[in-house]
């Protein structure tokens, strides 16, 4: 079963998918798709990185995050309605049969219309991350970045503007909490 | 164009390991986008997989045979391998090594198969 | 595993007559289904992947459709060349699975 994101018309939209690299920089290949991960790498690629860096991917699809720490979230700029589906995120880990795949979906919403636009905020710079990741060792937590100085005011806009996103229901917690694998 | 040849005994006795080889050339083992894969089709039978190998050391074997296969790879011979144990007559087949291109447009490359036959 | 099955096991036509296959799967399989042609003594061919698309080198009469779990292959004006048992795969799940093949014969 997949895990369901969310983002409006026009916004960037984020899928999580990290790994534990062996040693750092000691990479793995990786591929993005759309549609569901299938037996052979993904269906339909928009991104695929090797052992040293993203090796290709197709407009408005990029790695924001720490790919050299195993961070290959995907970053979809300017999403339109299209853009709902299934998204694969598989990680060819060496040994048998030790891949990970992880099917995420993802629904767009029309946007809200409001008298004034409001400034896109990007969410993954905004908060830290507390992830789980399963890889080439064992699980092991982690947390990526810290909290901006960020008043009140700053925080409740980005709850308003992230709270059909499956981390809004941390923003209290002072950090989204992400568990893939 | 890639190309691969299969080679290895095409008979072994029941209980034995069937070893095959595949050579692959006009292309590197180990350069991404290529499933190097190894394939079988019982005599007058439809095609069953067997495993594959990813240059990033990923590797899939078919749950069926998994307890018994082994699938590895030489990249400075440009080589890879199956290894089948404790074979009974079932394991009679055509095998065949592919490479199953998956970047870009899809398409694969096989070997013209060797037939292996399991008996006394 | 996911199951395969082709209909019909054996078509009887003469050159120049449309080719229809079928396959369905089990389970659904998305559009990840492809098509092959083997002739006797040779190695699987190729034909279709993910469902609708033509691989290199194949002519245009080879024509895929379907998604899920009904998959079509048809040949739009059969070629002496074309008389061959055809396979269809999957490969949404693993282990990639193949259908028992459909034979493609002259009448």
């Known amino acids: 079963s997949e895990v369901e994101y969310r983002a409006e018309v026009g916004q960037n939209a984020y899928l999580p998918c990290f790994y534990t690299p062996a040693a750092p920089g000691n990479l793995v290949p990786v591929c993005w798709g759309k549609g569901a991960c299938p037996v052979f790498e993904c269906g339909n690629v928009v991104l695929r990185t090797d052992e040293r860096d993203v090796n290709y991917w197709t407009s408005r699809y990029q790695l924001k995050g720490n790919f050299y720490k195993g961070d290959v979230s995907l970053t979809i700029e300017n999403v339109t309605l299209a853009d709902s589906g299934i998204y694969c995120c598989r990680i060819q880990i060496p040994g048998i049969m030790n891949d990970e795949k992880f099917n995420l979906k993802l629904v767009i919403k029309p946007a809200k219309v409001t008298p004034a636009p409001t400034r896109q905020r990007d969410f993954t710079a905004a908060f830290p991350r507390m992830l789980t990741t399963r890889g080439h060792g064992p699980a092991e937590t982690q947390t990526l970045g810290s909290l901006p100085d960020i008043n009140l005011t700053q925080i409740s806009t980005l709850a308003n503007e992230l709270r059909d996103s499956r981390l809004a229901n941390d923003l209290r917690d002072s950090g989204a909490t992400i568990r893939i694998g | 164009q890639v190309q691969l040849q299969e080679s290895g005994p095409g008979l072994v006795k029941p209980s034995q390991t069937l070893s095959l080889t595949c050579t692959v050339s006009?292309?590197?083992?180990?350069?991404?986008?290529?499933?190097w894969s190894w394939i079988r089709q019982h005599p007058g039978k439809g095609l069953e997989w067997i495993g594959y190998?990813?240059?990033?050391?990923?590797?899939y074997y078919n749950p069926s045979l998994k307890s018994r296969v082994t699938i590895s790879v030489d990249t400075s011979k440009n080589q890879f391998y199956l290894k089948l144990s404790s074979v009974t007559a079932a394991d009679t087949a055509v095998y065949y090594c592919?490479?199953?291109?998956?970047?870009?447009?899809?398409?694969?490359?096989w070997g013209q198969g060797t037939l292996v036959t399991v008996s006394s | 595993e996911i199951v395969l099955t082709q209909s019909p096991a054996t078509l009887s036509l003469s050159p120049g007559e449309r080719a229809t296959l079928s396959c369905r799967a089990s389970?659904?399989?998305?559009?990840?289904l492809a098509w092959y042609q083997q002739k006797p003594g040779q190695a699987p061919r190729l034909l279709i992947y993910?469902?609708?698309n033509r691989a290199t080198g194949i002519p245009a009469r080879f024509s895929g459709s379907g998604s899920g779990t009904d998959f079509t292959l048809t040949i739009s004006s059969l070629e002496p060349e074309d008389f061959a048992v055809y396979y269809c795969?999957?490969?949404?799940?693993?282990?990639?699975?193949f259908g028992q093949g459909t034979k493609v014969e002259i009448k």
């Open positions: 592919a490479s199953l291109m998956v970047w870009g447009v899809m398409g694969d490359y």
């Open positions: 006009g292309g590197s083992i180990s350069s991404g986008g290529y499933y």
């Open positions: 190998i990813y240059y990033s050391g990923s590797i």
């Open positions: 389970q659904s399989v998305s559009s990840y």
């Open positions: 993910d469902a609708s």
């Open positions: 795969q999957q490969r949404s799940d693993w282990p990639p699975t």
